[in-house]
């Protein structure tokens, strides 16, 4: 009652290996690493057969089939390339994930190389079975920002793509009769979040109250260059409007807010986020140069009052920008204390501008980011938000523009953007 001698499968083995197999003897067929037992179209780790009374084996010896990890999963904002010829997906084959450059980069700076493991899964040395994450690249416009000193007041045009984080925020408050309509600026922080000043997003009709506008009344334009031509821009409605809980309407302290967009915006040459600073109370150092862009008043010969009273558009048609130095807190505080009126330059603010005037942000630029180039990271960082200015004309002598100090709010911003109240679970680069 001996059973015939067994031939182990290719890429496999039989245990125990005996010269003779008798009735009731059992053998276990297994495969080499990276191969699986294939039997009746079923895949298994091992297969047992038994020598029967009649001298026959209970089953035929199965074959060993190479493990196949299958087509790799797609990567959001990324792509996959095969390192092995013929795009093989079998054991020990390699693939490489990469992010859509230059708009996205890989989190954790992993190589992105995945190998088909013996278990049938694509595996990376660091991330194991998890896919890499492609995060938006912040603060690196596709065109380098020039070194020229331009101004928003009396300024020349910014070129398309110089400020890809710049957002135009249009608010139409239909809860009031008649409707109130105004605009401001903001800065893209990620595919779904806009940073702006709180005063841009509060109802205008009750000057001593902080009533946030309804999300339905907010439209955000990104990738916009000329306000007369919105065809190339991405427009988005708001999913949430979040004003800083301590925003003070009397002195504009904590003048910072977020808008979560209804759906993530596609990033590209004209739509890219700005980086947030490190959370530090000092803020930008005096004399550091920053850039601000906006569609606010740009005619140096027309007064704010004239523009307001004329009822003509306050917008500059084409985005303007200005380069301004940060002013020491003491100097700015002193310049405002010397004025009549109750001006308060708090520790949550910093000032920028020139003693002699001539270059400044103005009405309609509110909420735009004051960006400074960080030499260490080689990124542009949003250090400030256009907040308020003195009673005199924009660009007047010794009237500095006042900006919200963003570095004081980084923790609050991350908290809000990653809170369960956020409409989706959003990944934001830190």
């Amino acid at each position: 009652n001996e059973c015939p001698k067994l031939q182990p499968p290719v890429y496999g083995k039989i245990e125990p290996s005996q010269a003779v197999y008798s009735f009731k003897d059992q053998v276990l067929v297994s495969c080499d690493t990276g191969y699986k037992v294939l039997k009746d179209n079923g895949v298994m780790d091992t297969f047992q057969i038994e020598c029967l009374k009649d001298g026959a084996w209970s089953n035929k010896i199965p074959t060993c089939k190479i493990v196949d990890c299958g087509a790799p999963a797609g990567l959001k904002h990324g792509l996959v390339t095969f390192s092995t010829r013929n795009n093989l997906t079998t054991y020990k084959s390699e693939i490489r994930y990469s992010c859509q450059q230059p708009y996205y980069k890989m989190l954790h700076n992993t190589t992105g190389v995945y190998t088909c493991s013996a278990h049938g899964t694509w595996t990376n040395e660091v991330l194991k079975r998890s896919l890499p994450t492609c995060l938006p690249v912040c603060g690196q416009p596709s065109r380098a920002l020039p070194n020229l000193v331009k101004r928003i007041i009396g300024g020349r045009n910014a070129e398309l793509g110089l400020f890809p984080w710049q957002a135009l925020i249009v608010v139409e408050d239909t809860s009031r009769v008649p409707n109130d309509k105004w605009f401001g600026s903001g800065a893209l922080l990620s595919e779904s979040w806009i940073l702006t000043a709180a005063h841009v997003l509060r109802s205008q009709r009750r000057d001593n109250t902080v009533i946030p506008v309804s999300k339905e009344h907010v439209t955000v334009y990104l990738g916009l260059h000329d306000v007369r031509d919105k065809s190339g821009a991405v427009n988005s409605s708001a999913a949430r409007v979040i004003l800083h809980p301590d925003f003070n309407i009397q002195n504009y302290n904590h003048d910072i807010a977020l808008v979560q967009l209804q759906k993530p915006v596609p990033l590209g040459a004209h739509v890219m986020p700005i980086c947030l600073p490190r959370p530090e109370p000092e803020g930008p150092a005096p004399h550091m140069l920053g850039l601000v862009a906006g569609w606010g008043i740009s005619n140096p010969n027309v007064t704010v009052d004239e523009i307001i009273l004329s009822g003509t558009r306050t917008l500059s048609d084409v985005l303007q920008y200005v380069k301004l130095p940060v002013v020491s807190h003491a100097e700015c505080k002193a310049s405002y204390e010397s004025r009549s009126g109750n001006y308060s330059v708090t520790e949550n603010m910093f000032c920028a501008g020139y003693y002699e005037g001539g270059k400044d942000t103005c009405l309609g630029d509110s909420g735009g980011a004051f960006v400074i180039f960080d030499e260490m990271s080689q990124h542009w960082v949003a250090q400030g938000l256009v907040s308020w200015g003195g009673p005199e004309e924009c660009g007047s002598k010794q009237v500095y523009g006042v900006y919200t100090k963003v570095s004081n709010y980084v923790d609050w911003l991350w908290e809000e953007m990653n809170s369960p109240r956020a409409v989706r679970d959003l990944q934001v680069e830190r």
């Epitope: 239909t174 009769v177 205008q204 009709r205 109250t209 307001i308």
Partner: antibody, heavy 113, light 112 residues
């Protein structure tokens, strides 16, 4: 067209509370602020406060905080104002209005012992 | 609170005459962001609810006869009736909504 119909006249005793109603028709009730105004002969018009029915957000004139309470029922398109601890000073005509434009028919409240 | 002062408190004119009434606010009602003066004029005829005539200081509400004109900016505002009609007999109120709203004391228009 837009109309605001207010509840009928009320004769109340001092110390009591009264709830006035304002039913809106002809527009989307939830999307516009409803304001309340008090008018007494010789005292002109006084703004009491406002409510945005869709969100329940309210603003009160400091003078009427604790005296007036606003609510709104979106299912019936009706705004309400409750006046508490009534005194003779509360005897007046009370109007609701849609934000700035359309005024209600008015409700006369008389407080008398 | 913003104080609204109307003058005169009353005036009597003959039908067909031009009439102007003034409303002054204790602070500017001009919002620089929306570029609007948050001032409205209302007409209240005897035994009736007030009716909106003018908003944003100078915009005539639809259906209001063009003999009613609002003007002014900042703190000084005027309502002009170019040719008074008998049905214009009423009290005219200004109201600011720049801040927590306040009304002027009213100008009573009587027809001689």
């Amino acid at each position: 067209q837009v109309q605001l119909k207010q509840s009928g006249a009320e004769l109340m005793k001092p110390g009591a509370s009264v709830k006035l109603s304002c039913k809106a028709t002809g527009y989307t009730f939830t999307g516009k602020w409803i304001e309340w105004v008090k008018q007494r002969p010789g005292h002109g018009l006084e703004w009491i406060g406002e409510i945005l029915p869709g969100t329940g957000s309210t603003n009160y004139n400091e003078k009427f905080k604790g005296k007036a309470t606003f609510t709104a029922d979106s299912s019936s398109n009706t705004a309400y104002m409750q006046l508490s601890s009534l005194t003779t000073e509360d005897s007046a005509m009370y109007y609701c209005l849609r934000s700035e434009d359309v005024w209600g028919t008015g409700t006369t409240v008389t407080v008398s012992s | 609170d913003i104080v609204m002062t109307q003058s005169p408190s009353s005036l009597a004119v003959s039908a067909g005459e031009k009439v102007t009434m003034s409303c002054k606010s204790s602070q500017s009602l001009l919002n620089s962001r929306t570029r609007k003066n948050y001032l409205a004029w209302y007409q209240q005829k005897p035994g009736q609810s007030p009716k909106l005539l003018i908003y944003w200081a100078s915009t005539r509400e639809s259906g209001v006869p063009d003999r009613f004109t609002g003007s002014g900016s900042g703190t000084d505002f005027t309502l002009t009736i170019s040719s008074v009609q008998a049905e214009d007999l009423a009290v005219y109120y200004c109201k600011q909504s720049y801040n927590i709203p306040t009304f002027g004391g009213g100008t009573k228009l009587e027809i001689k």
